[in-house]
């Protein structure tokens, strides 16, 4: 389970309401850090182990997911054809 935590606000500039946000995720046994719907998430460790990245549903709703060659990451293809590539080190 993950929750978005607001870390701080820039109080020195009242007009700026931009807050720095981060995810805090508490994973269950058998889960490790991953990405679901373009957000940090806890995912089945076997997905990471086997590099079946698309199984963790990393792309936004309506986008298509494809594995990169050698399973080095994945691409998310938007309906308009724009492609976002994520590589895993």
């Amino acid at each position: 389970t993950c929750e978005i935590v607001t870390l701080d606000r820039d109080s020195s500039q009242p007009r700026r309401t931009i807050a720095r946000q981060t995810a805090r995720c508490a994973c269950r046994k058998g889960q490790i850090a991953g990405t679901t719907r373009a957000r940090p998430a806890c995912v089945d460790a076997r997905i990471i182990k086997t590099k079946q990245w698309c199984d963790m549903l990393p792309c936004l709703e309506g986008e298509g997911c494809d594995l990169l060659i050698n399973r080095s990451g994945w691409t998310c293809t938007q309906p308009g054809g724009r492609i976002k590539t994520t590589t895993v080190s």
């Epitope: 508490a26 994973c27 046994k29 058998g30 889960q31 490790i32 850090a33 940090p40």
Partner: antibody, heavy 129, light 103 residues
Framework: AVTLDESGGGLQTPGGALRLSCSAS????????MFWVRQAPGKGLEYVSE????????NYGSAVKGRATISRDNGQSTLYLQMNSLRAEDTGTYFC??????????????????????WGHGTEVIVSS | ALTQPSSVSANPGETAKITCSGG???YGWFQQKPGSALVTVIY???ERPSDIPSRFSGALSGSTNTLTITGVQAEDEADYYC???????????FGAGTTLTVL
Amino acid sequence: AVTLDESGGGLQTPGGALRLSCSASGFDFSSHGMFWVRQAPGKGLEYVSEITNDGSGTNYGSAVKGRATISRDNGQSTLYLQMNSLRAEDTGTYFCARSTYECPGGFSCWGDTGQIDAWGHGTEVIVSS
Amino acid sequence: ALTQPSSVSANPGETAKITCSGGVYSYGWFQQKPGSALVTVIYWDDERPSDIPSRFSGALSGSTNTLTITGVQAEDEADYYCGTEDISGTAGVFGAGTTLTVL
């Protein structure tokens, strides 16, 4: 190199208490789930306890549940095991072990017994009157 | 409880296989020689630490993991324990150990 160094063992009396320590070096201690595993003389390995990388989650084997407390100090890179109401059957060598997965910042992760990639040399505990 | 054979024997140069079943998530294999520290030879099903010889390998099939030692050597004689999570997925568990004898 990854090093795990246990201490705190020795001769204990039944009903007594002890605190084992495991000093870790050579890796980012705060990113790894950690374990205590024990081995009675001439016997096999027994799961004792584990703790998540950030210390928020703990788990215990049935033989020590209610008598043991696992904790960690990530600032000092040290793992602890407090054992109360000691029994003769607690006699054995206690090992500290690391789970290989490096949990990223913002995540709390459990280790996995099948992912143990490093062990300490162990500290011997003898419970006898 | 995990199931692993109590003993396995092989001649030098032969292949020795030790199986372990009954757990979930991932499996590891831990070597223990008399009077020596525990050594991980395989972790996360099939990963081998950099200082472990390539003759050691692990493979997962369903819920059974097999440790294979290809071209067994005399120094491989030891007790081998498998480790994983119990079937409930809530706690760790180890097999009773397999004694590998090199004939």
